[in-house]
């Protein structure tokens, strides 16, 4: 299936040009999306091109400025947040990135009634997290690992926690491992629906081993960065959940929510919190051996001012073939009765589907079914449930939005997006207003992305929010590569692949092949999305064929494929890349003397193992910030898929699956190893150990480090990185510069 045909005709040939590396590094062909900042059923805020904050009313067609760019500029604000009572706006400035999601910032509160900043009892700086209550204009914020509450922006703060300590006790914000591997947020506090209660997590990292690395900066002596970071098998953070009444915070103080007995009996994690009503909350817990998850519904007991979590309201989710959930355990979406809920988990055939749980998980009613997967539940209203799946036309790498009418019997299903812009749009997400009165659809491809606004009752398109016209015009004279998404059937395994082909691709010719791999558990690389990136340039200008393959361990094609890698990472992911390469050679247009593989992070691990597989298939390859041994990576992630590195569990495979164990096998390939020295995620240690093993084996290789750069290798390092990798590949493929 050719998704993006090249627009080359003889008459145009001399005006058309190939992509350049400069195009990619400058972001010349980047696209825009439009996500409304919903403030009601029919209103949203948006930051205009000239930086005014504008309110749009869909029903009246009006739009008006609520905050001028002058006010924004006066404090150098880069972000804002309107209080639910519409009286105040917080303005965020001095953004300072910490880890993937976390950052600190300075916050100013602007009073919209008088057009002035709130003076007196100003917020301290820098703040780690700040948010409005869902009703009114209470503020909760985290400063120096402690939580504070303000009833009104101008009021003095009430301090909720006192034990917060850098790198030791975290209140209302996650520690490193919870941020990256469990919550995927910068916050760990949750307001109840009407702002009566505030729930928060406390993480105790006192006993966690610390990763320490040098940050060189430009001082005489480097700084040492210390992060409590539990590697596989190490001591983990201890988590506790508390809830405080924000109306009378001093009256009873924070009340701890009890952990289910079956969870508390051994090491465990807290995985998410969902408020149901102001007096009912749902907590999800996970055993350290991550195949058992417990969902616990707790109720406020007015008489005791405590939270009660009866055993009858505990729902267990267990996997016998792998780990619980997909990447994370899914979260519940509660219905209007405030006790039953909808949740995605594996059905009896091993496909993730939506289930309706009224009393017990055993009696769950399956809402969706088929040899495809439900991916996200966006919204449940009185009469509709909106979700995304990859059902349409049996392409796992697509995402369409569906509506199930739950108000009628039997429930009827309608695909909202399948036929809207069928060629252009096959990968959607959505953003819903209150009560799903309206929603925005954001289409990511395969054509140029487009964002549209729709009526929540009729699904009618109201207007285009962003169609990337400038990008469309800019691409008119560019020879883009062709892209196709197809599948290989090998030994009862389906391997979906995306192939990116040079603009004048000719099947009778031979082309160098570059495999781009990620391959991590529950990931997906073969997606019907638009991208003009480095590999687009390599196909367009340098005449390479690039392929991405989703092998065993990847997501959204059922548990058989997903859980195939359970307890044995580094085996089947690599095998499936190699199998695909052999199939590509059989297609007849690949020069088998010029095949390379590259990947980043988990992809760097897979590419390293593929190069060291001893097949002789690969001439060269690149590993960027690779994992080299699972003993070096984070406990929460690693143990989910590998179990523990102990003799009586899975130590043997931990040892067998390292890159270092295969050092000898790099002798006959050209290997480029790249890592940032300040990588807080996949520590530089990983590449240091690969390099040491290669040196000890007297194997030649190339390497590049990026001083003081983290896992993302951003800024000027990005330009240097892609330039360096381009030279390496062109040399490997004997392409002239």
């Amino acid at each position: 299936i050719v998704l993006r045909p090249s627009r080359v005709h003889n008459s145009e040939e001399n005006t058309m040009r190939a992509l350049t590396l400069k195009d990619i590094l400058n972001g010349t062909f980047s696209y825009k999306t439009f996500f409304p900042n919903w403030i009601s059923g029919q209103e949203y805020l948006h930051q205009s091109a000239d930086n005014n904050i504008v309110l749009y009313n869909i029903e009246t067609g009006q739009s008006y400025t609520i905050l001028s760019n002058r006010t924004m500029k006066s404090v150098n604000a880069s972000n804002y947040g309107l209080s639910p009572d519409r009286q105040f706006v917080y303005l965020e400035s001095d953004y300072s990135k910490l880890w993937r999601y976390s950052y600190t910032a300075t916050y100013y509160i602007y009073d919209l009634s008088n057009g002035e900043f709130v003076r007196g009892n100003e917020l301290p700086r820098p703040i780690q997290y700040l948010c409005w209550s869902p009703v009114g204009s209470k503020l909760a914020y985290v400063y120096q690992n402690n939580i504070y509450l303000k009833q009104r922006p101008g009021d003095p703060p009430f301090q909720i926690t006192f034990n917060g300590r850098e790198n030791k006790i975290f209140n209302g914000i996650p520690d490193w491992v919870y941020e990256e591997e469990m919550l995927a947020t910068k916050y760990a506090l949750w307001w109840s629906p009407n702002g009566k209660f505030l729930a928060y997590a406390e993480f105790n990292d006192t006993d966690i081993p610390v990763i320490a690395y040098s940050y060189y900066g430009d001082e005489q002596y480097p700084r040492t960065i210390n992060i409590p970071y539990p590697k596989a098998g190490a001591k983990n953070p201890v988590v506790r959940i508390f809830i405080i009444d924000t109306t009378y915070p001093a009256y009873v103080g924070p009340q701890e929510v009890p952990v289910p007995a079956m969870i508390a009996s051994s090491d465990y994690y807290f995985s998410w919190l969902t408020w149901v009503t102001d007096e009912r909350v749902c907590l999800q817990w996970l055993k350290r051996v991550q195949n058992v998850s417990v969902l616990s519904i707790c109720d406020f007991r007015e008489d005791w001012q405590t939270w009660d979590c009866p055993k009858t309201q505990e729902h267990i989710e267990e996997s016998r073939t792998g780990w619980a959930g997909g990447f994370f355990v899914s979260t519940p979406v509660f219905s209007y009765d405030a006790i039953s809920y909808y949740k995605i988990f594996s059905d009896k055939d091993g496909y993730k589907h939506i289930h309706y749980i009224k009393d017990t998980v055993e009696n769950a009613i399956q809402i969706t079914s088929g040899k495809w997967e439900a991916i996200n539940i966006f919204r449940v209203t009185q009469d509709s449930l909106f979700y995304s799946s990859n059902e349409f036309e049996e392409y796992p790498g697509r995402r369409n939005i569906y509506r199930i009418s739950i108000g009628s019997y039997p429930p009827s299903k309608k695909c909202v997006t399948c036929h809207l812009r069928k060629e252009r749009c096959q990968y959607y997400t959505a953003s819903f207003s209150d009560y799903a009165k309206y929603y925005a659809l954001v289409c990511y491809g395969p054509g140029i992305p487009i964002s549209t606004l729709h009526d929540g009752r009729t699904d009618q398109e109201i207007k285009i929010l962003e169609e990337n016209k400038e990008l469309e015009n800019a691409l008119k004279n560019i020879q883009l590569p062709k892209e196709e998404i197809k599948k290989l059937e090998v030994d009862e395994i389906t391997l979906w692949y995306k192939m990116i082909l040079p603009p004048q691709f000719d099947r009778s010719k031979k082309y160098p092949l570059l495999i781009q791999v990620y391959g991590g558990p529950c990931s997906q690389s073969v997606r019907s999305v638009f991208a003009v990136n480095w590999i687009s340039y390599l196909a367009s200008k340098e005449g390479m064929v690039i392929a991405l393959v989703d092998g065993r361990g990847t997501a959204f094609q059922g548990d058989k494929l997903l859980y195939a890698v359970y307890r044995k990472l580094g085996v089947y992911e690599v095998e499936d890349q190699i199998t695909a390469v052999r199939k590509f050679i059989e297609m007849g247009f690949i020069d088998e003397k010029r095949i390379a593989i590259w990947g980043w992070s988990y992809g760097g691990y897979v590419s390293s193992l593929a190069l060291a597989s001893g097949t002789g298939l690969f001439k060269c390859g690149i590993a960027v910030a690779p994992v080299s041994s699972w003993e070096y990576y984070a406990s929460v992630y690693t143990e989910r898929f590998m179990g523990l590195p102990t003799k009586d569990d899975n130590l043997e495979h931990y040892k067998n699956s390292t890159v270092m164990a295969r050092a000898e096998y790099f002798r006959n390939v050209d290997y480029l190893l790249i890592h940032g020295t300040a990588d807080d995620n996949v520590h530089f240690q990983n590449s240091a150990q690969i390099a040491k093993a290669l040196v000890n084996a007297q194997v030649d290789f190339q390497a590049m480090w990026y001083s003081d750069q983290n896992h993302g290798l951003s800024g000027l390092s990005t330009n240097h990185l892609y330039t360096h990798m381009t030279h390496f590949l062109k040399q490997c493929f004997s392409l002239s510069d």
Epitope: E43, L55, T60, G61, Q62, Y64, T65, L67, R86, V89
Partner: nanobody, 115 residues
Framework: QVQLQESGGGLVQAGGSLRLSCAAS????????MGWYRQAPGKRREWVAT???????NYADSVKARFTISRDNAKNTVYLQMNSLKPEDTAVYYC?????????WGQGTQVTVSS
């Protein structure tokens, strides 16, 4: 062009009542969230009350249980019923959208409460 006309102010004794009206024209109607605001002499303008499109109301602590905001969708008018008035309620009262339109305030209506 958005136009909001406040009326109904006046001089009243402490403990008395007044009913303010805000007539909306242009594209403003029941599909907008509306608010009443006030500015006392020598003080900053402050929010008083809000009514949403669905009729949900919200009040400043200082006026709770004394003031009532309402709307008549047919007449495109928003009201503020003020009971048990106090001298500290003396101010110029304005109506606007909520959140208010940036830099767009009418003349307001003066309310004076004598002791």
């Amino acid at each position: 062009q958005v136009q909001l006309q406040e009326s109904g102010g006046g001089l009243v004794q402490a403990g008395g009542s007044l009913r303010l009206s805000c007539a909306a024209s242009g594209s403003i109607d029941s599909r907008n969230t509306m608010g009443w605001y006030r500015q006392a002499p020598g003080k900053r303008r402050e929010w008083v009350a809000t009514i949403t499109t669905g009729g949900r109301t919200n009040y400043a602590d200082s006026v709770k249980a004394r003031f009532t905001i309402s709307r008549d969708n047919a007449k495109n008018t928003v009201y503020l019923q003020m009971n048990s008035l106090k001298p500290e309620d003396t101010a110029v009262y304005y109506c606007n959208l909520a959140p208010p339109i940036f830099n767009s305030w009418g003349q307001g209506t003066q309310v004076t409460v004598s002791s």
